[in-house]
Structure formats: structure tokens, C-alpha cells
């Protein structure tokens, strides 16, 4: 259940409304342990997470990364270009989060639930931001073409790809929520 | 089993450096956060800084900062300190912890701790 | 910086009792609290993490509770082998911070 939606919450009418960063909070730990559960289908189905080789596949692929120069690291933080990096790096996922929507076959759910919770993250962030014209948005086309190159990888390629995704957008998020917690 | 086992401290002048190593095993070492805690003779137990797996974000104690430096080299699976500028009030038994990190993605929390390595400063 | 008030320092207490430890935070920390366990000569020990969860190999009498900005660990039916220092850490913010102890005595 995504966070807003506990049942629990409705039965608490005097539970203090969250607020926006406490909602952002619960929304990147909520979208966390999806990954969480994606990660353990993806480890146990192939050995992709102990493999030597991720290194190789990792520069084809041009996964969004925190960098020091972005400002969201505790040396030189910056809250309003960390959070242009925070939401660029969100939109630049959300073709990689397609790509997972066809790659689990107990947790299909669950993928479908981490891109569903990252769009509403989002829109959340967005409302945070100050200075919107700074955040670019990947170009659709670019994104369509990706897409179909991902899925005319072979076998390996795939599983190797889908591990890497997962674990960049974990350590993407937990950047992300560090750093919001700073803010 | 999972072992983290310090080495590097000793005695050293105020103003001197000194660089602590970390050796892990046991478990998939670039997963984890990593982070070093000490404790002064009779004191409680104070954070100095941790190093994140992958994305090389560092975070540091204001009583460090500048002065400390937190790295890791995962091929090695190993966490170092260095340390540089060191006062007095840096004398410590300096603890290489590992956070739950790798398994409970969101929670700090440190579950595995070294024995710890002895700084003295002192003249 | 977030400050973390632990207390009481010390406490004296009967084996079987039922000891409380408090940690308050001076601003909210969400569910980021974890609580330790160092005995004279030891290393530390993680209790609980997530303010309430039991770290794998723990007692049962042990159990944690709270969130935002106030937490308390429950010793239920204390025993020779839990006299020992405990310690909060508040790992929401940066600096991280660790509470200042308390020392569970024998009465």
C-alpha cells in the first residue's frame, strides 16, 4: 500500500497530517522496499549480484548517478541545485523503470507499484522546487529508441541490465533521501 | 562469518597523522555502508563519519571535519581513516562498524563492529 | 544539529525489573533510532534499529518504541548479563549522534 493509503492512517484521526518532507520521506522508503523485493526476485533467479562483470555493462549504460558537483552530498550541499539533480535524475530513471515493467514475473506488482510511486515522487518534488526551468526532461524520442535498444539485448545483457538499474536506483534514492533530510 | 578487524593506531604528536585500515570478510563488502565510531577513554560513544557504497558520499563530525578523511577500496574490501591534524581529544579507541545498510535499505543502525584500534595523541 | 537527550544516566535496578531508557530528540528523526548495548572491556551491540525492530539474536525482553522525537527502550525482567552502558544514535541527519549513556547498575 502506497504511503497515504494505511489503513492504519485512517483509523487515526488524531495522528498530526504528514507533512510535505515527512510525505516525500515516507514516499522514497515506501519506493525503496519495492526495490527491496525487486532486488531479491532479480538475486535469486541469476548470481547478476555477486558478478564481477557489472563493471563492463555498467558503461553502456548511462544510469543517473549523485556526483559531489550536484549538492547533495554533506561536502559542498546546496539545497536548490541538489534538488534539480534529485528530480532530473528521477525523470532520467523513469525509462529505466519502464524497462523493468516486462522483467519480473512473481513480483510484476511490485515493479509496476516502484514506477507508479516514483511518478507521484515526483510531482511531490516538483512542488518543492523553486526554480523548475532548471530541471530538464529527457527527450521522449531518445527514451523510445533506448528502450528498444534494452530489449533486443540478449539474455545475460538483460539480467545484467535489469541489476544494474536496481541497484543504481537504490543508491540513487538513498542519496535522495539523505540529502532531502537536510533540507 | 562476517569480520571487520582495524589496524593503524598508535601513538602519535599533536599536529601528526596517521591513516586506520579496516580489513572486512564475510560478506559482499561494496553493499554496505561503512562507518567509523569512537570512544574516548571513559567516554561515550561519538560518530565520526561514514562512507556510502556506491555513490562515494562521505559525511563527517563537525569535531573531524577537514581534518579526517573517510575512503574505501572495494576490490580490496577495505575502509580506511585517515587522519590528519590530530589533537588531543582525538585519543580513541576507533571502531570500523558496519551499517544494516545492504539488507534493510532505509535504517541506519550498526551491526557488526570491529575491536577497535587505540589512538593516543600525545606529546 | 539534531541533539539527542538520553536518560537517566545511571539507574540501579533489581534483577526482574522492568527498565526504561528514554532518548529524545530535538527535532524529528522519523523512525531512525537504534539503540545499543556495551558491557565493561566489550564492543557495542545493536538492540534495535528502526526504533522498534529487534536485531537478529536478541532477547525478546528487550523492545523498542517511539518516533519523531521520543523513544524508549524496555528491558522486561532485567538479568544479571543486561547490566551494562546503553546508547541511542540518531542516524535521520547529518552529523549522526550518538545519545550520552546509561548505565544500568545492580540495586
Known amino acids: 500500500v502506497p504511503p497515504g493509503e494505511d489503513s492504519k492512517d485512517v483509523a487515526a484521526p488524531h495522528r498530526q497530517p504528514l507533512t510535505s518532507s515527512e510525505r516525500i520521506d515516507k514516499q522514497i522508503r515506501y519506493i525503496l522496499d519495492g526495490i527491496s523485493a525487486l532486488r531479491k526476485e532479480t538475486c535469486n533467479k541469476s548470481n547478476m549480484c555477486e558478478s564481477s562483470k557489472e563493471a563492463l555493462a555498467e558503461n553502456n549504460l548511462n544510469l543517473p548517478k549523485m556526483a559531489e558537483k550536484d549538492g547533495c552530498f554533506q561536502s559542498g550541499f546546496n539545497e536548490e541545485t541538489c534538488l534539480v539533480k534529485i528530480i532530473t535524475g528521477l525523470l532520467e530513471f523513469e525509462v529505466y523503470l519502464e524497462y523493468l515493467q516486462n522483467r519480473f514475473e512473481s513480483s510484476e506488482e511490485q515493479a509496476r507499484a516502484v514506477q507508479m510511486s516514483t511518478k507521484v515522487l515526483i510531482q511531490f518534488l516538483q512542488k518543492k522546487a523553486k526554480n523548475l526551468d532548471a530541471i530538464t526532461t529527457p527527450d521522449p524520442t531518445t527514451n523510445a529508441s533506448l528502450l528498444t535498444k534494452l530489449q533486443a539485448q540478449n539474455q545475460w545483457l538483460q539480467d545484467m541490465t535489469t541489476h544494474l538499474i536496481l541497484r543504481s536506483f537504490k543508491e540513487f534514492l538513498q542519496s535522495s533521501l539523505r540529502a532531502l533530510r537536510q533540507m | 562469518q562476517v569480520q571487520l578487524v582495524e589496524s593503524g593506531g598508535g601513538l602519535v604528536q599533536p599536529g601528526g597523522s596517521l591513516r586506520l585500515s579496516c580489513a572486512a570478510s564475510g560478506f559482499t563488502f561494496s553493499n554496505y555502508y561503512m562507518t567509523w565510531v569512537r570512544q574516548a577513554p571513559g567516554k561515550g560513544l561519538e560518530w565520526v563519519s561514514s562512507i556510502y557504497s556506491f555513490s562515494g558520499d562521505t559525511a563527517y563530525a563537525d569535531s573531524v571535519k577537514g581534518r579526517f578523511t573517510i575512503s574505501r577500496d572495494n576490490a580490496k574490501n577495505t575502509l580506511y581513516l585517515q587522519m590528519n591534524s590530530l589533537k588531543s581529544e582525538d585519543t580513541a579507541v576507533y571502531y570500523c562498524?558496519?551499517?544494516?545498510?545492504?539488507?534493510?535499505?532505509?535504517?541506519?543502525?550498526?551491526?557488526?563492529w570491529g575491536q577497535g584500534t587505540q589512538v593516543t595523541v600525545s606529546s | 544539529d539534531i541533539q539527542l537527550t538520553q536518560s537517566p544516566s545511571s539507574l540501579s535496578a533489581s534483577l526482574g525489573d522492568s527498565v526504561t531508557i528514554t532518548c529524545q530528540a530535538s527535532?524529528?528523526?522519523?523512525?531512525?533510532l537504534s539503540w545499543y548495548q556495551q558491557k565493561p572491556g566489550q564492543t557495542p551491540k545493536l538492540l534495535i534499529y528502526g526504533a522498534s525492530k529487534l536485531q537478529t539474536g536478541v532477547p525478546s525482553r528487550f523492545s523498542g518504541s517511539g518516533s519523531g522525537t521520543s523513544f524508549t527502550l524496555t528491558i522486561s525482567g532485567l538479568e544479571a548479563e543486561d547490566l551494562a552502558t546503553y546508547y541511542c544514535?540518531?542516524?535521520?541527519?547529518?552529523?549522526?549522534?550518538f545519545g550520552q549513556g546509561t548505565k544500568v547498575e545492580l540495586k
Open positions: 544514535l540518531q542516524g535521520y541527519r547529518w552529523p549522526f549522534m
Open positions: 562498524t558496519r551499517n544494516l545498510g545492504g539488507v534493510v535499505v532505509t535504517t541506519n543502525g550498526y551491526d557488526y
Open positions: 527535532q524529528s528523526i522519523s523512525d531512525e
